[in-house]
């Protein structure tokens, strides 16, 4: 069975104060203080379920609960909680009031009882300025006594031996004689026993985390009914108290909801059962990243490794004397750690197998300040294989290149930092390029000519080993255009089509035995190639969608000279839409009427084969339709002044009108515009 422990607010401290040091029971005030430094209020409870009072926290994050003079009704066990909006602390230690004229009963506790080691017994007395005495059962006099030392005292047994076993209790007394004594604490039995074996301790996710991440530590043991304690850098920070744990708990989950930069460090846990403790768990190093700049990770001799061989991963950091960690994607914990005096660390992957393939990254962190870490390095892909993966060859901006232009052939694959070979069909020699971070697989061809066209492929060319087989990439056909007369391109039924409709793009050439190539602006590869028997290729586009909109062109080449292609056809813009785009409306020579002069309004749309209509102040203008989009406006009696807009419809789709253009205002010139001027 497991016990879910959400990192609770640390338990508050409960103590008593009095203004009668010789007879504290005459006026006692209980105080509760939160160690967390922030809480809204405190609740004082008696005997577990009696609600005594609730008090707001002062600036010192504490609250007073005045009890006054003790009466029989005050007898009982008190504890307090801090209480916030969505967080309730664990209970404080219980303060026991046992009578009307007697000091509160102290509480005795001890560190683990380990043979030969020093043991500390803690006696908590609740009131300041009290003396303390430690008793061992069977002995009349106190074993040890301590004067006024605050609210608690620590008794030490230097070296725990069999003779020190037994029942111990402690008492407190008033500072001045005649002493007034407390009841003895409940007895504590000290038994030297073997320690329980260390618990199993891990984090659910990786212990290398970014700020704000959620981290759960899991501490577990096969032993039943245990309480657990979580330590950070050797100090206790949280516990699953038995009183808060389900019976039979064999595990505790300690949750940090949102990790801060100061939460890094060495975490460990222990469990205990009454006086028997476990060995501490193996530590988990929690590293909080993104404090220092990222390191660089490189593979030597390279990132592709033959099975059974070894590879060194070098993590190059920025600062001296850091601790480095190597991480593999998918691995729960860092694979290796290295503490170095310099600013880089070498990690050896020895006799690698297929399971070692994957993305690796590294970090560095300081071990003195909460394990503050760097950003993660860029991932490095390590391939354990006897055969390189196939690279991919493509051209940028396109594999169809006008004569005299520039093009870059890219050989790209999942393996980086490797050399490449570019091979052209029919040529004996190949171009060779060593990979780097800046020009990973780029083969630029400037001022392209007919000699560059043809079929290309590429492959990896590692310089560090010959035992790994290589595979060629896909074949890329590089076409050079501008060597034949251009074809024409038109759309059937027209350049605008509704989504889901079919259309055909017809590329018409002038020469027989031609292969036609359809191109789209922005695409690196031709969309389609056709070798018709005649002079025209019909590129069928069924059920077009919005993404088929764009600017198309076509070229062709002859069977006798493949890859030596024609000039591009004129571009053809295709619109896949239910609503044609709006036209633009402009005025010539200007938007201001001059005496006796007309104005021509020019409506221009992006599609051919359309009919335009003009609107004046929301109504159809007198000269309603125009096929070329030109409308002549005069200003007889000032009727031409006002707002104009225009729309168009396709002749193929006469029921579909475009959006109207943006409005355009025509104005009259200052002065008597329409007034005649007579002489004599």
């Amino acid at each position: 069975e497991e016990t879910e422990i959400v990192m609770p607010t640390p338990k508050p401290e409960l103590w008593a104060e009095t203004n009668f040091p010789l007879a504290p029971w005459k006026n006692l005030t209980l105080w509760c203080r939160s160690p967390s430094g922030s809480t809204k209020e405190f609740v004082l409870l008696k005997d577990g379920t009696g609600w005594i009072a609730t008090r707001p926290a002062s600036e010192q994050v504490r609250a007073a609960f005045p009890l006054g003079a003790l009466t029989q009704s005050h007898t009982g066990s008190y504890h307090c909680h801090s209480w916030e909006e969505m967080a309730v602390s664990e209970p404080s230690e219980a303060l026991e009031l046992v009578g009307t004229d007697i000091l509160p009963k102290p509480v005795i506790s001890a560190s683990p009882t380990i043979r030969g080691q020093e043991l500390q017994l803690r006696c908590k007395g609740w009131l300041a300025g009290m003396g303390f005495a430690l008793y061992k059962e069977g002995e009349q006099e106190p074993v040890q006594q301590l004067g006024a030392v605050g609210r608690e005292a620590f008794f030490t047994i230097q070296r725990m031996e069999d003779k020190d076993e037994g029942n111990y209790s402690c008492r407190t007394h008033t500072e001045k004689r005649p002493f007034k004594w407390s009841e003895p604490s409940e007895p504590l039995e000290l038994v030297i026993k073997e320690m329980y074996p260390k618990p199993f301790f891990k984090t659910w996710a990786s212990p290398v985390v970014t700020p704000g991440a959620r981290v759960t530590f899991n501490c577990s043991t096969p032993h039943q009914h245990m309480s657990f304690i979580l330590y950070k850098d050797g100090s206790e920070i949280a516990s699953s108290d038995r009183s808060w744990a389900s019976p039979g708990a064999s595990a505790a989950h300690f949750l940090i909801i949102s990790v801060g930069i100061g939460d890094g460090g060495n975490y460990s846990c222990r469990y205990y059962d009454f006086s028997i403790w476990s060995e501490p768990s193996d530590p988990v190093e929690l590293v909080v990243t993104e404090f220092y700049p990222k390191p660089t990770l490189l593979a030597q001799p390279g990132p592709v490794v033959f099975p059974g061989k070894s590879v060194i991963l070098r993590c190059q950091g920025t600062f001296q004397g850091m601790r480095f960690a190597l991480l593999q994607e998918g691995a729960h914990v860092p694979l290796q750690f290295r503490s170095v005096s310099g600013n880089s660390a070498d990690f050896l992957l020895h006799t690698v197998g297929a399971e070692d393939s994957g993305n690796y990254s590294c970090i560095y962190y300081e071990t003195t300040m909460s394990n503050r870490g760097s950003y993660l390095s860029m991932p490095l892909m390590i391939w354990v294989t006897d055969t390189f993966p196939k690279p991919w060859l493509f051209a940028e901006p396109s594999s169809v290149v006008p004569m005299g232009q520039n093009v870059t052939l890219w050989c790209r694959g999942p393996v980086h930092g490797v050399g490449y070979i570019l091979h052209k069909e029919g040529e004996a020699t190949s171009m060779q390029l060593w990979g780097s971070t800046s020009n990973d697989g780029a083969f630029p061809i400037t001022n392209i000519s007919g000699t560059s066209m043809g079929r290309y492929s590429c492959c990896y060319h590692p310089d560090w080993t010959s035992s790994i087989k290589i595979q060629p990439s896909n074949t890329l056909e590089l076409l050079v255009t501008g060597l034949l007369p251009k074809p024409s391109l038109l759309a059937q039924p027209g350049p605008m089509v509704a989504p889901g409709e079919n259309m055909t793009l017809q590329c018409q050439g002038e020469l027989p035995d031609s292969t036609f190539v359809l191109l789209k602006e922005g695409a690196q590869e031709p969309l389609e190639q056709q070798r018709p028997s005649g002079y025209r290729a019909d590129f069928w586009m069924p059920a077009v969608r919005g993404e088929d909109s764009g600017i198309y062109s076509c070229v062709y080449y002859l069977d006798s000279t493949p890859f030596a292609a024609s000039n591009h056809s004129d571009s053809l813009e295709i619109w896949v839409t239910d609503k044609p785009p709006k036209p633009s409306l402009s005025a010539w020579p200007s938007t201001m009427f001059k005496l006796g002069k007309d104005i021509t309004l020019q409506c221009r749309g992006p599609l051919p084969g359309v009919e335009f209509v003009l609107e004046h102040d929301g109504e159809e203008a007198p000269q309603q339709f125009s096929e070329d989009g030109d409308f002549v406006i005069n200003n007889v009696e000032g009727k031409g002044i006002g707002n104009y807009s225009c729309s168009y419809r396709l002749q193929a789709y006469p029921d579909i009108w475009s959006e109207p253009s943006d409005p355009l205002e025509l104005v009259g010139a200052a002065g008597p515009v329409a007034q005649e001027c007579t002489v004599g």
Epitope: K40, G50, W51, A53, M86
Partner: antibody, heavy 120, light 107 residues
Framework: QMQLVQSGAEVKRPGSSVKVSCKAS????????FYWVRQAPGHGLEWMGG????????NYAQKFQGRVTITADESTNTAYMEVTNLRSEDTAVYYC?????????????WGQGTTVTVSS | DIQMTQSPSSVSASVGDRVTITCRAS??????LAWYQQKPGRAPKLLIS???SLHPGVPSRFSGSGSGTDFTLTISSLQPEDFATYYC?????????FGQGTKLEIK
């Protein structure tokens, strides 16, 4: 905003018991205190006791100690008040109320009241 | 137990009047005092908490003052809906206790 809905009116015989429920909706009862207040016909308000559900901790006015039990069920967001050994002077409207904020700053949300009539 | 005493037990006033109700505690309650308004057949409604803090949604014509043992509730300009019974309550120590109430009637 939290709402408190109380159980319906009850008619009881002297010597019997009654258990009134108060269901909170709209927000968790996790960090609130709940109180019970009664009002006899033509009289003022009388504080009976309270509970903090998260602790299961209660406090009762001395007058009701031993005869009144206040409980809460966190899983259903419901508080209960049981009065045993009913007498005719227990005839009253019983209200449950929520303390505002964590600490007590006043009872800011009240139930509609449950009328309990004790009659032979 | 801390006794809370309100005065007057009842008061008659007209719309627009300024009305003051006082509440005295038998021992100091700091500022842990609340004021409530109750209309016939309805549950009480919180007006003021912590002696002087106006509860959200309560009209600004209501105000509270005082600390220790003496407290006042003031209505600066009576409105027709203000005619009701008003109670003070201490929250300094258990048991929390109410005043006997002040009935505000139309003159």
């Amino acid at each position: 905003q939290m709402q408190l809905v109380q159980s319906g009116a009850e008619v009881k015989r002297p010597g019997s018991s009654v258990k009134v429920s108060c269901k909170a909706s709209g927000r968790s009862t996790y960090n609130y205190a709940f109180y019970w207040v009664r009002q006899a016909p033509g009289h003022g308000l009388e504080w009976m006791g309270g509970i903090i559900p998260i602790f299961g901790a209660t406090n009762y006015a001395q007058k009701f100690q031993g005869r009144v039990t206040i409980t809460a069920d966190e899983s259903t967001n419901t508080a209960y008040m049981e009065v045993t050994n009913l007498r005719s002077e227990d005839t009253a409207v019983y209200y449950c109320a929520k303390g505002s904020g964590n600490y007590y700053y006043g009872m800011d949300v009240w139930g509609q009241g449950t009328t309990v009539t004790v009659s032979s | 137990d801390i006794q809370m005493t309100q005065s007057p037990s009842s008061v008659s006033a007209s719309v627009g009047d300024r009305v003051t109700i006082t509440c005295r505690a038998s021992q100091s309650v700091g500022t842990w005092l609340a004021w409530y308004q109750q209309k016939p057949g309805r549950a009480p409604k919180l007006l003021i908490s912590a002696a002087s803090s106006l509860h959200p949604g309560v009209p600004s014509r209501f105000s509270g003052s005082g600390s220790g043992t003496d407290f006042t509730l003031t209505i600066s300009s009576l409105q027709p809906e203000d005619f009701a019974t008003y109670y003070c309550q201490q929250a300094d120590s258990f048991p929390y206790t109410f005043g006997q109430g002040t009935k505000l009637e139309i003159k």
